[in-house]
């Protein structure tokens, strides 16, 4: 299985969809689990309704909800109020007996809210930077200085 990346914004909701063959997985409950380490077990977070015919009903565990469109063949997981600690590897699973087939491997990435930066407190305004071509450099995540290069001075 390839891993599908889903990106969400911190504090907002993220919907993860896992398509599957509805005939092949007919009658099977589904689950959403979190991968614990590269080779570790997949820890169950939430699963669909105990009665397969009621799989369309939303089931919730904390901020995570799951619902299954068994006819269309789409499992949907919603992560509410996404937080940095929600980032990581997950799986959508199809359950049969004590076994579980992987429907999709998922990587959840949590992006900083553009209005909720860690640098939200710096009172930056564009008008003070407008005259400096590279004023944004000091805010980039990482930047290597070339030999002999002088770091760009703060704008204020």
């Amino acid at each position: 299985h390839n891993t599908t990346v889903f990106q969400g914004v911190e504090g907002q909701s993220l919907q993860v969809s896992c398509p599957y063959d509805s005939m092949k997985h007919w009658g099977r409950r589904k689950a959403w689990c979190r991968q614990l380490g590269e080779k570790g077990p997949c820890q169950r977070v939430v699963s669909t309704h105990n009665l397969w015919l009621l799989s369309f009903l939303r089931r919730r565990n904390g901020s995570t909800a799951i619902t299954d469109d068994t006819l269309g063949g789409t499992l949907t997981i919603t992560l509410r109020n996404l937080q940095p600690h929600d980032a990581g590897f997950y799986q959508c699973q199809s359950l049969h007996g004590s076994e579980a087939d992987t429907l999709r491997k998922v990587l959840v990435e949590v992006l900083a809210d553009p209005l909720d930066h860690r640098d939200a407190g710096d009172l930056w305004v564009p008008g003070e930077s407008e005259s400096f071509e590279d004023a944004h450099v000091e805010h980039s995540i990482s930047r290597s200085l070339l030999e002999g290069e002088i770091p760009f001075p703060p704008t204020s």
């Epitope: 553009p114 209005l115 407190g121 009172l123 564009p126 003070e128 407008e130 944004h136 805010h139």
Partner: antibody, heavy 122, light 113 residues
Framework: EVQLLESGGGLVQPGGSLRLSCAAS????????MGWVRQAPGKGLEWVSA????????YYADSVKGRFTISRDNSKNTLYLQMNSLRAEDTAVYYC???????????????WGQGTLVTVSS | DIVMTQSPDSLAVSLGERATINCKSS????????????LAWYQQKPGQPPKLLIY???TRESGVPDRFSGSGSGTDFTLTISSLQAEDVAVYYC?????????FGGGTKVEIK
């Protein structure tokens, strides 16, 4: 739930002093710039002052520069505005507001407190 | 300092009709590095503090109904309420977030005709 609660307003004589406080809750206060905006009775909004998250930067409107001092105590989640040499034209509702923004966004005010009334009169 | 000028001072519009508020800045608030205009709009209902509606001239704050829209660039901006509702009665302010000192427009009062 994010809450900002101003206090310290009241009636003061011209030339007098007042210290306004704004108690913040429901968010990580120390991550955010904060500001004061005032509104004279029946008038529009006037930005007064702002302070960066770590208190390293402060800004003031020309109308209050040299008379007002903004400060914050991140350990107490509280913003302050020390107002000296008050004038009749400083009479207004003073709102405390969180400065939403950051690099590439620029400072906008949200959310706001309910405000505290400062009346300067003899 | 950037001076913000709003027009009209007040506006009476029938329910369901369009309301248009203008805001002009004394200098451009367009940041060339990202091509964004640093202009915000606020709504202040009677007896309440202001509420942020729009930033970057046209980006709606989450939870703001889509009947509110912002447009314009450089120095001339518009807030449009496409279909006025009773709950939209308020004073609307523009604010530049381009340069310190931050400045607000004088406000536009929107009423129902």
């Amino acid at each position: 739930e994010v809450q900002l609660l101003e206090s310290g307003g009241g009636l003061v004589q011209p030339g007098g002093s007042l210290r306004l406080s704004c108690a913040a809750s429901g968010f990580t206060f120390s991550n955010y710039g904060m500001g004061w905006v005032r509104q004279a009775p029946g008038k529009g909004l006037e930005w007064v002052s702002a302070i960066s998250a770590n208190a390293g930067k402060t800004y003031y409107a020309d109308s209050v520069k040299g008379r007002f001092t903004i400060s914050r105590d991140n350990s107490k989640n509280t913003l302050y505005l020390q107002m000296n040499s008050l004038r009749a034209e400083d009479t207004a509702v003073y709102y405390c507001a969180s400065l939403r923004g950051g690099y590439e966004v620029g400072p906008t005010f949200d959310p706001w407190g309910q405000g505290t009334l400062v009346t300067v009169s003899s | 300092d950037i001076v913000m000028t709003q027009s009209p001072d007040s506006l009476a519009v029938s329910l369901g009709e369009r309301a248009t508020i203008n805001c002009k800045s004394s200098q451009s608030v367009l940041y060339s590095s990202n091509n964004k205009n640093y202009l915000a709009w606020y709504q202040q209902k009677p007896g309440q503090p202001p509420k942020l509606l729009i930033y970057w001239a046209s980006t709606r704050e989450s939870g703001v109904p889509d009947r509110f829209s912002g447009s314009g660039s450089g120095t001339d901006f518009t807030l449009t309420i496409s279909s006025l509702q009773a709950e939209d009665v308020a004073v609307y302010y523009c604010q530049q977030h381009y340069l310190w000192p931050i400045s607000f427009g004088g406000g536009t009062k929107v009423e129902i005709k």
